[in-house]
C-alpha cells in the first residue's frame, strides 16, 4: 500500500532571465527512493539515480543545474518555460509517486511564490 505523500512548491512564478528552484519532498513512507525524474510536460529535464547520480538532458545542459538535494534549479528563464513540471519519485517497494509544480515566468518584476500543497 502506498502511504507516502509528495509535498511540492506548488504554483510558483519567477522573472524572465532569472532562476527558480523546483523542489519536491516525499514523506510518510519508509520506501527507498531509487530514482527521481524531473519532467516538463513530456520532456525529460533531468534524472537523479540513487546509485549513479544526476543526468541532465543534453538539451537542457546549459540551463538546468542539479539540486539542492533532489530538487532542480532552472536558470536563464524564458516565457516559454511557463508550464507544468513533474517530479516523479521511483521507490521500492511502494512504486511511483508524482508531484506537480506550475511555473509562470513573468515579464514584469512582480513574481510571487504560491502556497505549498500536497499530492497523495
Amino acid at each position: 500500500m502506498m502511504t507516502g505523500t509528495i509535498e511540492t512548491t506548488g504554483n510558483i512564478s519567477a522573472e524572465k532571465g532569472g532562476s527558480i528552484i523546483l523542489q519536491c519532498h516525499l514523506s510518510s513512507t519508509t520506501a527507498q527512493v531509487t530514482q527521481v525524474n524531473w519532467e516538463q510536460q513530456d520532456q525529460l529535464l533531468a534524472i537523479c539515480n540513487a546509485d549513479l547520480g544526476w543526468h541532465i538532458s543534453p538539451s537542457f545542459k546549459d540551463r538546468v543545474a542539479p539540486g539542492p538535494g533532489l530538487g532542480l534549479t532552472l536558470q536563464s528563464l524564458t516565457v516559454n518555460d511557463t508550464g507544468e513540471y513533474f517530479c516523479i519519485y521511483h521507490t521500492y517497494p511502494d512504486g511511483t509517486y508524482t508531484g506537480r509544480i506550475f511555473l509562470e515566468v513573468l515579464e514584469s518584476s512582480v513574481a510571487e511564490h504560491g502556497a505549498r500543497f500536497q499530492i497523495p
Epitope: 530514482q35 525524474n37 525529460l44 534524472i47 539515480n49 546509485d51 549513479l52 547520480g53 544526476w54 543526468h55 541532465i56 538532458s57 545542459k61 543545474a65 542539479p66
Partner: antibody, heavy 128, light 108 residues
C-alpha cells in the same frame, strides 16, 4: 581521436604509495564519469572506483577493497584523471586501466552505464 | 553487492560454430545497466554490448546480447578467428559496479 593513456605504474614495496595518471583526449572530459578498473595477473576485471562528472560535483565512489586507501581525483583543465594509492598491499598488484563511463538516459527514461573507451593499462607491482 | 557468475569458464569451439555465453546475477539487475566486454591477451577490454542487447559502435552483427532479470546471454553466431578471447559481463546498478569472472572462448 578519443584516447586514454595511463602512466605512473611501477614496483613499490608493501605499505608504499603510488600515483597513477590518465591523460584523456578527443572528448569533453568534464562531461564524463571516469572509472578505474584493475586486473591482477591471470585474473578477471575488478572495478576500483569512479569520479562523477562536473554536473555531479566530481563525487567519488570506491570498491570496498580499496576504500580508505585509494583516492580518485581529476583535473579538467588538464583533461587528466588520477589514482592515488596508499598503504599498498601485495594483492593490489595488477594492471590498472582508466575507462570513460557513459551514463545517460535514452527513450522511456531507460538508463545506461558502461565503459566505452579504455586506456592501454599501466602495471603496478607491490612486492618486497 | 551483486555477484555475476559466468558460465562456462572455458568454451572450446571451432571457427564457424555458435558460441553461447551465460551471465547470471545473484539478484535482479536492470537490463539497461548490463554490458559485455571482450578482452584479448595483452590488450585492454573492448565494449561489445550495452543495455544487455545494444551493439557498441563498430561491433559486427554476429555478436548479440539478450536477457533480463538475473539471466543474460551473449551469443556469437559464427565464430571468426579474431573472436577467440575472454568475455566479461558487467552490471552498474545497484552499486557497486561488478564484473563477472569471465568466459574464455578458445579454439578447439
Amino acid at each position: 581521436e578519443v584516447q586514454l593513456v595511463e602512466s605512473g605504474g611501477g614496483l613499490v614495496q608493501p605499505g608504499g604509495s603510488l600515483r597513477l595518471s590518465c591523460a584523456a583526449s578527443g572528448f569533453t572530459f568534464s562531461d564524463h564519469y571516469m572509472d578505474w578498473v584493475r586486473q591482477a595477473p591471470g585474473k578477471g576485471l575488478e572495478w576500483v572506483g569512479r569520479t562523477r562528472n562536473k554536473a555531479n560535483s566530481y563525487t567519488t565512489e570506491y570498491a570496498a577493497s580499496v576504500k580508505g586507501r585509494f583516492t580518485i581525483s581529476r583535473d579538467d583543465s588538464k583533461n587528466s584523471l588520477y589514482l592515488q594509492m596508499n598503504s599498498l598491499k601485495t594483492e593490489d598488484t595488477a594492471v590498472y586501466y582508466c575507462a570513460r563511463g557513459q551514463y545517460y538516459y535514452g527513450s522511456s527514461s531507460r538508463g545506461y552505464y558502461y565503459m566505452d573507451v579504455w586506456g592501454q593499462g599501466t602495471t603496478v607491482t607491490v612486492s618486497s | 553487492e551483486i555477484v555475476l557468475t559466468q558460465s562456462p569458464g572455458t568454451l572450446s569451439l571451432s571457427p564457424g560454430e555458435r558460441a553461447t555465453l551465460s551471465c547470471r546475477a545473484s539478484q535482479s539487475v536492470s537490463s539497461s545497466y548490463l554490458a559485455w566486454y571482450q578482452q584479448k591477451p595483452g590488450q585492454a577490454p573492448r565494449l561489445l554490448i550495452y543495455g544487455a542487447s545494444s551493439r557498441a559502435t563498430g561491433i559486427p552483427d554476429r555478436f548479440s546480447g539478450s536477457g533480463s532479470g538475473t539471466d543474460f546471454t551473449l551469443t556469437i553466431s559464427r565464430l571468426e578467428p579474431e573472436d577467440f578471447a575472454v568475455y566479461y559481463c558487467q552490471q552498474a546498478v545497484p552499486s557497486p559496479l561488478t564484473f563477472g569472472g569471465g568466459t574464455k572462448v578458445e579454439i578447439k
